[in-house]
């Protein structure tokens, strides 16, 4: 058993049918010695008396808010949560496996630049009695500071019969140098509590590996005289690290017909302009990627050919 | 990345082309190592990230773009002496460059070159003959060092009398390649920045 926060405790259980469970001793936080009784949750049934209460915690029915009283007055509370270990592996019931970029990916994180700011998000089908708390650091043995905000519900979508909820959090490394070469990964730890179930999820990454630039901005077309060709131009996104000559991007320019089946013409360039043939009803899209470190491409920025 | 890449024209900052070749070569070598050594811990998540140049060179600090010198987190031990030799820059651009930066890059390359050559000698003794260092990568390191044109005493190749542990050598190769790829990215950024200056 360990303390998650004041008066909230996590009991770790080897989870299998007929498991013996864990013996837990609760102590009433009071100078009183006599006339103390214990109850669980809203029940008035007295579970025991005395300053300490010994219980065998086996299942969720044994978890909850234990309260000690004296003469009708509440003295203190202890909330017991359960953390299930199933055959040597901590349970992952609360969050959905996003399966991207690989199986068992519960937390996904992205950064728009090298400033040390990043966003993580996760998915769940649970809509109520759910709380998250997020901590982060650079490295684990001698951790350096990363500050995270509160996790917030950022999207809701319907998937088949189920509703899916997306939560996200923004974090910022306390003293980040955009040009630094990372040797210690960022660690992100999310504590999830659903009713009386506790779970924790972690992700470990280098900022350089989670970079995904914003799409190029100010995408414009300039027709070339007496030609089907157009000059496409764009700019680096505002959120990208500066100076751009140091943090350079490379670009992919795509001409896509109205039909998805039509052949796509693609050009790769390090410049912020390109000359392409603009077909009728086609659209021109441009996306960006770090020129020197192949992390994710940005989403496409698009303009119609007409 | 199999993209069409424009070849820089000869008027460009001469080291830019070499540094781009370096990054391509080390990235290819790392990809080859990951595939060949699939049963070894060779991915970024599995290896310890060690920097053999730590406390010996200061490339990131020495080559920091002027725009980032206002960022206190970037200023660990920045020294600001300006370039006095090295042939990478045309003379009119010399004043924009710090000697420490290019010499630091040169020292990095020299240290990695020695490590890679020592390692290759060990890998050649492996009865499995599983993996060797790409000669192209070693040649590209050499070309960039020559383009930098710094005079520095040669570091003797380390020789080891004891029987090599090939498992450890292959893991060390992965660690080295990961670190060298990261340094090659920094070198490319620096060259691109200097080229634009």
């Amino acid at each position: 058993i360990w303390e998650l926060k004041k008066d909230v405790y996590v009991v770790e259980l080897d989870w299998y049918p007929d498991a013996p469970g864990e013996m837990v001793v609760l102590t009433c936080d009071t100078p009183e010695e006599d006339g103390i009784t214990w109850t669980l949750d809203q029940s008035s049934e007295v579970l025991g008396s005395g300053k300490t209460l010994t219980i065998q915690v086996k299942e969720f029915g044994d978890a909850g808010q234990y309260t000690c009283h004296k003469g009708g007055e509440v003295l203190s509370h202890s909330l017991l949560l359960l953390h299930k270990k199933e055959d040597g592996i901590w349970s992952t019931d609360i969050l959905k496996d996003q399966k991207e970029p690989k199986n068992k990916t519960f937390l996904r994180c992205e950064a728009k630049n090298y400033s040390g700011r990043f966003t993580c998000w996760w998915l769940t089908t649970i809509s109520t009695d759910l709380t998250f708390s997020v901590k982060s650091s650079r490295g684990s043995s001698d951790p350096q500071g990363v500050t995270c905000g509160a996790a917030t519900l950022s999207a809701e979508r319907v998937r088949g019969d189920n509703k899916e909820y997306e939560y996200s959090v923004e974090c910022q490394e306390d003293s980040a140098c955009p040009a630094a070469e990372e040797s210690l990964p960022i660690e992100v730890m999310v504590d999830a509590v659903h009713k009386l179930k506790y779970e924790n999820y972690t992700s470990s990454f280098f900022i350089r590996d989670i970079i995904k630039p914003d799409p190029p901005k100010n995408l414009q077309l300039k027709p070339l005289k007496n030609s089907r060709q157009v000059e496409v131009s764009w700019e680096y996104p505002d959120t990208w690290s500066t100076p751009h000559s140091y943090f350079s991007l490379t670009f992919c320019v795509q001409v896509q017909g109205k039909s998805k089946r039509e052949k796509k013409d693609r050009v790769f360039t390090d410049k912020t302009s390109a000359t392409v043939i603009c077909r009728k009803n086609a659209s021109i899209s441009v996306r960006a990627q770090d020129r020197y470190y192949s992390s994710s491409w940005s989403e496409w920025a698009s303009v119609p050919c007409s | 990345r199999n993209l069409p890449v424009a070849t820089p024209d000869p008027g460009m900052f001469p080291c830019l082309h070499h540094s781009q070749n370096l990054l391509r070569a080390v990235s290819n070598m790392l990809q080859k190592a990951r595939q060949t050594l699939e049963f070894y811990p060779c991915t970024s998540e599995e290896i310890d990230h060690e920097d053999i140049t730590k406390d010996k060179t200061s490339t990131v600090e020495a080559c920091l773009p002027l725009e980032l010198t206002k960022n206190e987190s970037c200023l660990n031990s920045r020294e600001t002496s300006f370039i006095t030799n090295g042939s990478c820059l045309a003379s009119r651009k010399t004043s924009f460059m710090m000697a420490l930066c290019l010499s630091s890059i040169y020292e990095d390359l020299k240290m990695y070159q020695v490590e890679f050559k020592t390692m290759n000698a060990k890998l050649l003794m492996d009865p499995k003959r599983q993996i060797f260092l790409d000669q192209n990568m070693l040649a590209v390191i050499d070309e960039l060092m020559q383009a930098l044109n710094f005079n520095s005493e040669t570091v003797p190749q380390k020789s080891s009398l004891e029987e090599p542990d090939f498992y450890k050598t292959k893991i060390k190769l992965c660690i080295l390649l990961h670190a060298f790829r990261i340094r090659a990215v920094t070198i490319d950024r620096v060259m691109s920045y200097l080229n634009a200056s």
Epitope: D14, W15, Y16, P17, D18, A19, E59, F60, K85, E86, D87, G88, I89, D93, K102, N103, K104, T125 | F39, P41, E46
Partner: antibody, heavy 115, light 112 residues
Framework: QVQLVQSGGGVVQPGRSLRLSCAAS????????MHWVRQAPGKGLEWVAF????????YYADSVKGRFTISRDNSKNTLYLQMKSLRAEDTAVYYC????????WGQGTMVTVSS | SYVLTQPPSVSGTPGQRVTISCSGG????????VKWYQQLPGTAPKLLIY???QRPSGVPDRFSGSKSGTSASLAITGVQAEDEADYYC????????????FGTGTKVTVLG
Amino acid sequence: QVQLVQSGGGVVQPGRSLRLSCAASGFTFSSYGMHWVRQAPGKGLEWVAFIRYDGSNKYYADSVKGRFTISRDNSKNTLYLQMKSLRAEDTAVYYCKTHGSHDNWGQGTMVTVSS
Amino acid sequence: SYVLTQPPSVSGTPGQRVTISCSGGRSNIGSNTVKWYQQLPGTAPKLLIYNNDQRPSGVPDRFSGSKSGTSASLAITGVQAEDEADYYCQSYDRGTHPALLFGTGTKVTVLG
């Protein structure tokens, strides 16, 4: 004590269907994940499928994906394996088992796919 | 498609020490716990070892398990006639959990 009693096995022609059941008692069935494991005659153990305690997630071996469906009825304390498009290579003893560091197995039920 | 490899058979005389190896990789045994099962003819498998080296109550202490890196082993110290059976190791793969990965199985024969 924990008990898993299996039923539903038998002889079936290729291409036909069969449903296996596993009745649980002696524990809170709705709190635990469950597996199906099979063993072809004279061969080793092969995992078939898994279902979460609440039925929310199901996992299958590639060899049965799209043909077999694992399900559970927590109100009846019963686990099921619906097998469709059966093939000769599905001939095996099928076991249900609880998920956990200490596990309990059903007695097994023989499924024979033969024309 | 077994990824946990065991020797097909091992044998020993009563009282001898018999060991069965189970060889895997970084993503399975290297990252997860190992179990060992004993299966007597015509019966369901019985758990002998969980969590690499733990014995459930009721399992004789002549059975012991260990794990090192990407391999595990089961030792029977002082093998007895009633130990003649098939033995299977089991683990998980970190990418496909909760799918059970079973070893190829080892037939233990007690001679004499």
